[in-house]
Interface confidence: low
């Protein structure tokens, strides 16, 4: 969380996140764990006019697919 | 402690470009944004767009695509702003600024670099 | 993209006094709001990030509240040094933008 990432330097992707974002526009959506490099799950779409846009993690919409990618990473590790 | 060193004041030609810099230390560059945002008198602030040089990411803001390229070389942990085809609407305070530790607010500001595009 | 409605436009205020500066977003920004002082020919100096919390060794008589659309930094007593400008800046959604600004005189 914030408090906990201030006492380290840590390389996330997204500088801030689309509030808003209607599904059937995302292609191709990239789920980044948690981890040494960034504090919080970060998710990138690659939207089908060509941006790439950052997704709130905790939006109702993406939560089932994104604990679906998280898992299915977890399990070839 | 962080320190964002911006480049001198530039009085140039209309028509012609120009190049600010923005020297960080006190902090891992590729760690973080850089956003450069544009102040006029009257006009307030407004963001140009922002670069992320650890993963090579940059945004603009529509108002400044093709006006303004956002590039940094890692190597001096300096971030670049480039104008171009410069008019009089384009003399202004610009500043450099770094991300919050998790990218989405703006925590330490460059002094400003003042551009007049005079005849 | 979204509208910062940030008011008032100017104001002034005697020492001691409590000051309220309110920002309306277009849209809700769920508190992706912050709030950055400047004085005349100075760069800006971030006083509150994430609506609510307050950035390192900014004096603990700057607070911000809101959330939704609706956001206010409160200065609790006025002081000299803090006669400034004072912006708004929503940052959920991009691209990020500023209000414009509430210039903060002394009586």
């Known amino acids: 969380g914030p408090v906990s990432a201030v006492l380290t330097e840590l390389r996330c992707t997204c500088l801030r996140v689309t509030l808003r974002v209607n599904p059937k526009t995302i292609g191709k959506l990239q789920v980044f764990p948690a981890g040494p490099q960034c504090s919080k799950v970060e998710v990138v779409a690659s939207l089908k006019n060509g941006k790439q846009v950052c997704l709130d993690p905790e939006a109702p919409f993406l939560k089932k697919v994104i604990q679906k990618i998280l898992d299915s990473g977890n399990k070839k590790n | 402690q962080v320190q964002l060193q911006q480049s001198g004041a530039e009085l140039v030609r209309p028509g012609t470009s120009v190049t600010i810099s923005c020297k960080a230390s006190?902090?891992?560059?590729?760690?973080?944004?850089i956003v450069w945002v544009k102040q006029r008198p009257g006009h307030g602030l407004e963001w140009i767009g922002d670069?992320?040089?650890?993963?090579?990411?940059?945004f603009y803001s529509e108002n400044f695509k093709g006006k303004a390229t956002l590039t940094a070389d890692t190597s001096s942990s300096t971030a670049y702003m480039h104008l171009i085809s410069l008019t009089s609407e384009d003399s202004a305070v610009y500043f450099c600024?770094?991300?919050?530790?998790?990218?989405?607010?703006?925590?330490?500001w460059g002094q400003g670099s003042l551009v007049t595009v005079s005849a | 993209d979204i509208k910062m409605t940030q008011s008032p436009s100017s104001m002034s205020a005697s020492l001691g006094e409590r000051v309220t500066i309110t920002c309306q977003a277009s849209?809700?920004?769920?508190?992706?709001l912050s709030w950055y002082q400047q004085k005349p020919w100075k760069s800006p100096k971030t006083l509150i990030y994430?609506?609510?919390r307050l950035a390192d060794g900014v004096p603990s008589r700057f607070s911000g509240s809101g959330s939704g659309q609706d956001y206010s930094l409160t200065i609790s007593s006025l002081e000299s040094d803090d006669t400034a400008t004072y912006y708004c800046?929503?940052?959920?959604?991009?691209?990020?933008?500023f209000g414009a600004g509430t210039k903060l005189e002394l009586k």
């Open positions: 994430y609506a609510t």
């Open positions: 849209q809700d920004i769920e508190s992706y």
């Open positions: 006190g902090y891992t560059f590729t760690n973080y944004w």
């Open positions: 800046l929503q940052h959920g959604e991009s691209p990020p933008t």
């Open positions: 600024a770094r991300s919050g530790y998790d990218r989405t607010w703006f925590a330490h």
């Open positions: 670069l992320y040089s650890g993963g090579g990411y940059t």
